[in-house]
């Protein structure tokens, strides 16, 4: 059955809730594109590999991104 869609964004719902960086398996930041006009942040949790879309405008999520990038810069030589 073909699907009619205006854009191809992945996130149907978003979360404003803070996420503990230690509980993160993966954090995908998908930039806006011709397929989806907004930035999408998809968190994959260590527990059962659950996936959740995060609100890029949320203060808690912005803090999470800072914490993750700081952690990455520590690891890189």
């Amino acid at each position: 059955v073909p699907l009619s869609r205006t854009v191809r964004c992945t996130c149907i719902s978003i979360s404003n809730q803070p996420v503990n960086p230690r509980s993160l398996e993966k954090l995908e930041i998908i930039p806006a594109s011709q397929f989806c006009p907004r930035v999408e942040i998809i968190a994959t949790m260590k527990k059962k590999g659950e996936k959740r879309c995060l609100n890029p405008e949320s203060k808690a999520i912005k803090n999470l991104l800072k914490a993750v990038s700081k952690e990455r810069s520590k690891r890189s030589p």
Epitope: T6, C11, I12, S13, S15, N16, K51, C53
Partner: antibody, heavy 120, light 107 residues
């Protein structure tokens, strides 16, 4: 607690239009996707459409594509389904439902449903 | 398009275990949600993401997903469990997909 109050159903002639509404409360409406699902008399559940939290992404089932339009007003915390060019086979109970919130989409709270009868 | 196949009906003796299946190609690669629908009432989510139970749902309800079959199991079946049960997945090319539904009868 989550509440979804539906309105707008009724009897309508084939080819005419109808708009369903779903007023939401008890959760942050502007961060959740919303769905419409229908059930024809004696039949199973049939998904109709979904709209993303910001209204930017809309998916439709093939059976309603080009005839039905899903929309939302986040300031009013209300979901809509505009149904045009109605057919007898659109006769069903229509449910609005809140998205689960995680990926992949699911439906965790449902309205009580509103009956739409398309008949001449 | 992605399709989900459920048996039209399942019977279980009072107090016994009921098993409802949902078949789909490589369904184990998808997350399956289950809904209970009683006559005249709106559907209720009973299992989400294969095996998770909403807090209001009794522990007697459980789910699993492997290979080409997802399963809803209802332990110690009660008369109040009589209902239609639907499985559901999200498919990237077809959106929300429901199974045809299974009518559970408690004898």
């Amino acid at each position: 607690q989550v509440q979804l109050v539906q309105s707008g159903g009724g009897v309508v002639q084939p080819g005419r239009s109808l708009r369903l509404s779903c007023a939401a409360s008890g959760f942050t409406f502007s961060t959740y996707g919303m769905h419409w699902v229908r059930q024809a008399p004696g039949k199973g559940l049939e998904w109709v459409a979904v709209i993303s939290y910001d209204g930017g992404t809309k998916y439709y089932a093939d059976s309603v594509k080009g005839r039905f339009t899903i929309s939302r007003d986040n300031s009013m915390k209300t979901l809509y389904l505009q149904m045009n060019s109605l057919r007898t086979e659109d006769t069903a109970v229509y449910y609005c439902a809140k998205d689960l919130g995680d990926l992949p989409p699911g439906l965790d709270y449902w309205g009580r449903g509103t009956m739409v009868t398309v008949s001449s | 398009s992605y399709e989900l196949t459920q048996p039209p009906s399942v019977s279980v003796a009072l107090g016994q275990t009921a098993t409802i299946t949902c078949g789909g190609s490589s369904i184990e690669s998808k997350s399956v949600h289950w809904y209970q629908e009683k006559p005249g009432q709106a559907p209720v989510l009973v299992i989400y993401k294969d095996s998770n139970r909403p807090s209001v749902i009794p522990e007697r309800f459980s789910g699993s997903n492997s290979g080409n079959t997802a399963t809803l199991t209802i332990g110690r079946a009660q008369a109040g469990d009589e209902a239609d049960y639907y499985c559901q997945v999200w498919d990237s090319s077809t959106g929300v997909v429901f199974g045809g539904g299974t009518k559970l009868t408690v004898l």
